[in-house]
């Protein structure tokens, strides 16, 4: 039986050009995490394998950095980065757990005061 739950950073509103950290945390299970995949829509962004470490998809290498932890840092944000991101935890013996985070990237002129802007 799958008893675990995924906690995420929560949805994030950020400004174009900034950077943000996407993070998920798997709790309430003793299952072993064998691999974590980060995906956007149907695109694979990165993989963190327990034995082999990190692999960043070539098309994202210049803007995606591994970590902190099992999280992912997205840099030089563009409006095209707006969308849903998935952290997919492959575990043994439980199986797969998935978390969802929506990232909204706003043009500077429409960004709310609460939107995050960080120098990459």
């Amino acid at each position: 039986m799958m008893t675990g739950t995924i906690e995420t950073t929560g949805n994030i509103s950020a400004e174009k050009g900034g950077s943000i950290i996407l993070q998920c945390h798997l709790s309430s299970t003793t299952a072993q995490v064998t691999q974590v995949n980060w995906e956007q829509q149907d695109q694979l962004l990165a993989i963190c394998n327990a034995d082999l470490g990190w692999h960043i998809s070539p098309s994202f290498k210049d803007r995606v950095a591994p970590g902190p932890g099992l999280g992912l840092t997205l840099q030089s944000l563009t409006v095209n980065d707006t969308g849903e991101y998935f952290c997919i935890y492959h575990t043994y013996p439980d199986g797969t757990y998935t978390g969802r985070i929506f990232l909204e990237v706003l043009e500077s002129s429409v960004a709310e005061h609460g939107a995050r802007f960080q120098i990459p």
Epitope: N11, I12, L106, G114, A115
Partner: antibody, heavy 117, light 112 residues
Framework: EVQLQQSGPELVKPGASMKMSCKAS????????MSWVKQSHGKNLEWIGL????????SYNQKFKGKATLTVDKSSSTAYMELLSLTSEDSAVYYC??????????WGQGTSVTVSS | DVVVTQTPLSLPVSFGDQVSISCRSS???????????LSWYLHKPGQSPQLLIY???NRFSGVPDRFSGSGSGTDFTLKISTIKPEDLGMYYC?????????FGGGTKLEIK
């Protein structure tokens, strides 16, 4: 002035599908996401999902995955929602709403859908 | 999914009253950056819902200052300082911090 003009009421038969529209004006269509909301029988509001007009990316409430399909036509600044395999449970008023910072700041007037044989 | 509970379900008022509507979520609505995506809407009969408050306490443009929002974490409140006839209708809170976005069940503001 921001305006969202939705298509008119629909009477459809069970098992059929239908597509409603939401034409945006008064702002840059690709700068904001568009959400869709269901209101059944004048009761609770449910978030169906949203679409990013810039790249067509979508996010769905799992409850509506396979029931609703969201698309956009950038050239006409129009968002669409197709409802599939309709049943009486889908009879409702459906709203489109412009989204920013995870709130919905401007709403269409709503499209009433009645599913009946 | 995050469950959002609104109280009361119905709120009988007289014009000029001050009222509060409560909204509670099943988990914290603060994201990892400290931003909280909690908004409030008024839905009048025969009209579309309208945004009143976003980000807990920010009044949307054109919304009178008799409407105010407060709260943090899992507990949020909408206050209306002096009820006017145009304030009657259904009030909803919405959390947008976690996927999917979820609405409260609504509070009906009606005349006593």
């Amino acid at each position: 002035e921001v305006q969202l003009q939705q298509s008119g009421p629909e009477l459809v038969k069970p098992g059929a599908s239908m597509k409603m529209s939401c034409k945006a004006s008064g702002y840059s269509f690709t700068t904001y996401t568009m959400s869709w909301v269901k209101q059944s029988h004048g009761k609770n509001l449910e978030w169906i999902g949203l679409i990013n007009p810039y790249n067509g990316g979508t996010s769905y409430n799992q409850k509506f995955k396979g029931k609703a399909t969201l698309t956009v036509d950038k050239s006409s600044s129009t968002a669409y929602m197709e409802l599939l395999s309709l049943t009486s449970e889908d009879s409702a008023v459906y709203y489109c709403a412009r989204s920013r910072s995870f709130a919905m700041d401007y709403w269409g007037q709503g499209t009433s859908v009645t599913v009946s044989s | 999914d995050v469950v959002v509970t609104q109280t009361p379900l119905s709120l009988p008022v007289s014009f000029g009253d001050q009222v509060s509507i409560s909204c509670r979520s099943s988990q914290s609505l603060a994201n990892s950056y400290g931003d909280t995506y909690l908004s409030w809407y008024l839905h009048k009969p025969g009209q579309s819902p309208q945004l009143l408050i976003y980000g807990i306490s920010n009044r949307f443009s054109g919304v009178p200052d008799r409407f105010s929002g407060s709260g943090s974490g899992t507990d949020f409140t909408l206050k209306i300082s002096t009820i006017k006839p145009e304030d009657l209708g259904m009030y909803y809170c919405l959390q947008g911090t976690h996927q999917p976005w979820t609405f409260g069940g609504g509070t009906k503001l009606e005349i006593k």
